[in-house]
């Protein structure tokens, strides 16, 4: 039996509106019906939680109301979107997947996606 592998893109560039999307794919060792997905941000040696959702296979991901993340799932793939990003949020975003039910529990953690965020230049005042 193999450890659970999680794949995610190495680099993503956020849009000018501060939105970044990436796919997190996991090779499930079992037939999970309940999955927990957490996005972590690693800066220096500090790891913080960005958002987390638990979902039943085939259902939508439900993040907390005040979450900056949204997502959808399809099989062993999760499409994650993080919004409201600023240049200071540039960093490594790690996808963590946990197969919660039925037993046995499995943990898989991706290598991280480096998200680059560039704040848009303010529009110059126009003289009319």
């Amino acid at each position: 039996c193999k450890a659970m592998h999680v794949a995610q893109p190495a680099v993503v560039l956020a849009s000018s509106r501060g939105i970044a999307s990436f796919v997190c794919e996991y090779a499930s060792p079992g037939k999970a019906t309940e999955v927990r997905v957490t996005v972590l941000r690693q800066a220096d040696s500090q790891v913080t939680e960005v958002c987390a959702a638990t979902y039943m296979m085939g259902n939508e991901l439900t993040f907390l109301d005040d979450s900056i993340c949204t997502g959808t799932s399809s099989g062993n793939q999760v499409n994650l979107t993080i919004q409201g990003l600023r240049a200071m949020d540039t960093g490594l975003y790690i996808c963590k997947v946990e197969l919660m039910y039925p037993p046995p529990y499995y943990l898989g953690i991706g290598n991280g996606t480096q998200i680059y965020v560039i704040d848009p230049e303010p529009c110059p005042d126009s003289d009319f």
């Epitope: 039996c1 450890a3 957490t38 963590k96 943990l107 953690i109």
Partner: antibody, heavy 118, light 106 residues
Framework: QVQLQQSGPELVRPGASVKLSCKAS????????INWVKQRPGQGLEWIGW????????IFNEKFKGKATLTVDTTSSTAYMELHSLTSEDSAVYFC???????????WGQGTPLTVSS | DIVMTQSHKFMSTSVGDRVSITCKAS??????VAWYQQKPGQSPKLVIY???TRHTGVPDRFTGSGSGTDFTLTISNVQSEDLADYFC????????FGVGTKLELK
């Protein structure tokens, strides 16, 4: 700084139940799973289970299903483990530990010694 | 269950020596392995996680290596305060620990 403060030593009769507590401070309680680990004198560490304070979900070591009940009180940032139908085999030190976001048990309580004796 | 085997229950060393403690997983756990140090009457303390990452405040004489099924904790220039029990643990599935290796003076 992260701290887990556990309740004091317990001496209980066989067949009884006991409820151990673990009060967390220095971090956001709902973000991290709280684990419980058993250590018998001179022996290794045995994982009992964990609870996710945000939604109360629990993962158990099958061996301890029916033996332990895990709960949390998020208002006081306290985790509890109740052990039922105690026997001498349950005499041990019980640790609570925070599971770090990347998986390891990064901070531990000081342990609660439990003695089951008539 | 994933079984973590620490084949040496005791290891003898001297201050200033280099010592390696080994641990073998019964199946592939990638790098989801941690090492803990426990002194008598104390709780375990995290030393290494992700097989090779030192926890906050751990001296750089502690190094971890390995992936898959074979893992090693190496302490170079052993100090008297390093004499303790060392447990490996996997967290690829629900946590399981090795039985521990007691590091003692020769």
């Amino acid at each position: 700084q992260v701290q887990l403060q556990q309740s004091g030593p317990e001496l209980v009769r066989p067949g009884a139940s006991v409820k151990l507590s673990c009060k967390a401070s220095g971090y956001t309680f709902t973000t991290y799973d709280i684990n419980w680990v058993k250590q018998r004198p001179g022996q290794g560490l045995e994982w009992i289970g964990w609870i996710y304070p945000r939604d109360g979900s629990i993962i158990f070591n099958e061996k301890f299903k029916g033996k332990a009940t895990l709960t949390v009180d998020t208002t006081s940032s306290t985790a509890y483990m109740e052990l039922h139908s105690l026997t001498s085999e349950d005499s041990a030190v019980y640790f609570c530990a925070r599971r770090g976001l990347l998986g390891p048990l990064d901070y531990w309580g000081q342990g609660t010694p439990l003695t089951v004796s008539s | 269950d994933i079984v973590m085997t620490q084949s040496h229950k005791f290891m003898s060393t001297s201050v200033g020596d280099r010592v390696s403690i080994t641990c073998k997983a019964s199946q592939d756990v990638a790098t989801t392995v941690a090492w803990y140090q426990q002194k008598p009457g104390q709780s375990p303390k995290l030393v290494i996680y992700w097989a090779s990452t030192r926890h906050t405040g751990v001296p750089d004489r502690f190094t971890g290596s390995g992936s898959g099924t074979d893992f090693t904790l190496t302490i170079s220039n052993v100090q008297s305060e390093d004499l303790a029990d060392y447990f490996c643990q996997q967290y690829s599935s629900y946590p399981t620990f090795g039985v521990g290796t007691k590091l003692e003076l020769k």
